[in-house]
Interface confidence: medium
């Protein structure tokens, strides 16, 4: 049969951050190519990354259509043949279905990782500092505009702020379910800040990595008496 020499894909892995979503798998192809299919639980299969020699497929355009849907994906291993007319169907020249491997179910809203946040600015007024976290743009669209992380997650998303005096290592924390913190600081002291995005309602992928550290006395800050 035409598929006897193909190797089924394995180690299928979803890599997704802020809804940018790529399906990866092994092995590197030898005498075969891959085609990926994706569907919702109730929908039809849609083919992507036709006859690719890559071992990854960007499925972002599909999953952002509804990030609260559950998606199924599978990778077909297709024999590499040069046919006389230069075209192949997914099911080979003899109509048999090539071997495929299913990926685990993927629910973008639950499974996408939170990207590393960025501190947009901080402003000191007397003994208070307002720290603002940048609202990261996602690839989820609404009316042809890209939505931010807050647009998509709303109250599900909180931020944790870690802050400490430049002169010491003792960290304090604050939390917000907006993108802003207002914290008390000691006058005349410089502070450093780092933030982390958190979705408390999740059981996995709850936290992002910490943002780069920003310290008072650097460009991002502003000081007013």
């Amino acid at each position: 049969s035409g598929t006897t020499n193909t190797v089924a894909a394995y180690n299928l892995t979803w890599k997704s951050t802020n809804f940018k979503t790529i399906l990866e798998w092994e092995p590197k192809p030898v005498n075969q190519v891959y085609t990926v299919q994706i569907s919702t639980k109730s929908g039809d299969w849609k083919s992507k990354c036709f006859y690719t020699t890559d071992t990854e497929c960007d499925l972002t355009d599909e999953i952002v259509k509804d990030v609260k849907q559950t998606y199924l994906a599978r990778v077909f291993s297709v024999p590499w043949r040069n046919s006389t007319h230069g075209k192949e169907t997914l099911f080979g020249t003899h109509g048999e279905e090539p071997p495929f491997t299913n990926a685990r179910k993927f629910l973008p809203y639950r499974d996408t990782k939170l990207g590393q946040p960025t501190i947009q600015s901080f402003e000191q007024v007397g003994t208070k500092v307002n720290v603002t976290v940048e609202d990261e743009r996602t690839l989820v669209r609404r009316n042809n505009t890209f939505l931010s992380l807050r647009d998509v997650f709303g109250k599900d998303l909180i931020y944790t702020l870690y802050y400490w005096k430049s002169s010491s290592s003792g960290k304090k924390t604050a939390k917000t379910n907006t993108n802003e913190f207002l914290i008390d600081v000691d006058k005349g002291e410089n502070y450093c800040f780092s933030v982390q995005a958190v979705i408390p309602s999740r059981t996995v992928n709850r936290k992002s990595t910490d943002s780069p550290v920003e310290c008072m006395g650097q460009e991002k800050g502003e000081f007013r008496e």
Partner: antibody, heavy 120, light 113 residues
């Protein structure tokens, strides 16, 4: 079509326990918050708390924390609001609602309400 | 908690005339991250469950007639009905959808003169 169907009216005595339900259909139940809202006779709307059925994560209004319990069974697409010991002041219409698709975009779908009457 | 204050509490209107309801919040509902105001408007018609009209202060929910519009930013918001119809009677509520606990205004009762 998205629908939230609530259990029927209840008449209870003070001190009794009660659980009312809200069954969702026409959408994937797990990733949408279910909100509970109280409306006392002739009064306005009061937000009580919410639950994300996929994980059972809840948030309560401080005004209701400790007096009610919100839970959900995602396998049957149903959320619950329960009291262990009712008071006369719990007499009200209770609505469940589903959050909108986008973050913090309001309560897009509402149940028909469950009237709870607590009287000795 | 964020306190939501609506005015007026009662609004008699002649059909075909415009109507305006004000809602003020005790804290800003503007997210500096994405410049969205998390203010929501609902209408509860007599004997019915509330229905969503406007979210993000100015985004009309699908199916809501375009005679309804929302505006405002920060702490001051307005719901306008360009031409009131008989079916618009009921109680209008604004809601803080920005931060927990979510809070409603006390309601504005619109009635036909």
């Amino acid at each position: 079509e998205v629908q939230l169907v609530q259990s029927g009216a209840e008449v209870k005595k003070p001190g009794e326990s009660l659980r009312i339900s809200c069954k969702g259909s026409g959408y994937t139940f797990a990733p949408y918050w279910i909100e509970w809202v109280r409306q006392m006779p002739g009064k306005g709307l009061e937000w009580m708390g919410d639950i994300l059925p996929g994980t059972g994560f809840t948030t309560y209004s401080p005004s209701f924390q400790g007096h009610v319990t919100i839970s959900a069974d995602k396998s049957i697409s149903t959320a619950y609001l329960q009291w262990s010991s009712l008071k006369a002041s719990d007499t009200a219409m209770y609505y469940c609602a589903r959050s909108g698709y986008y973050g913090n975009s309001g309560f897009a779908y509402w149940g028909q309400g469950t009237l709870v009457t607590v009287s000795s | 908690d964020i306190v939501m204050t609506q005015t007026p509490l009662s609004l008699p209107v002649t059909p075909g005339e415009p109507a305006s309801i004000s809602c003020k919040s005790s804290q800003s509902l503007l997210s500096s991250g994405n410049q969205k105001n998390y203010l929501t408007w609902y209408l509860q018609k007599p004997g019915q469950s509330p229905q969503l009209l406007i979210y993000w202060a100015s985004t009309r929910e699908s199916g809501v007639p375009d005679r309804f519009s929302g505006s405002g930013s920060g702490t001051d918001f307005t719901l306008k009905i360009s031409r009131v119809e008989a079916e618009d009677v009921g109680v209008y509520y604004c809601q803080n959808d920005y931060t927990y606990p979510l809070t409603f205004g006390q309601g504005t009762k619109l009635e036909i003169k």
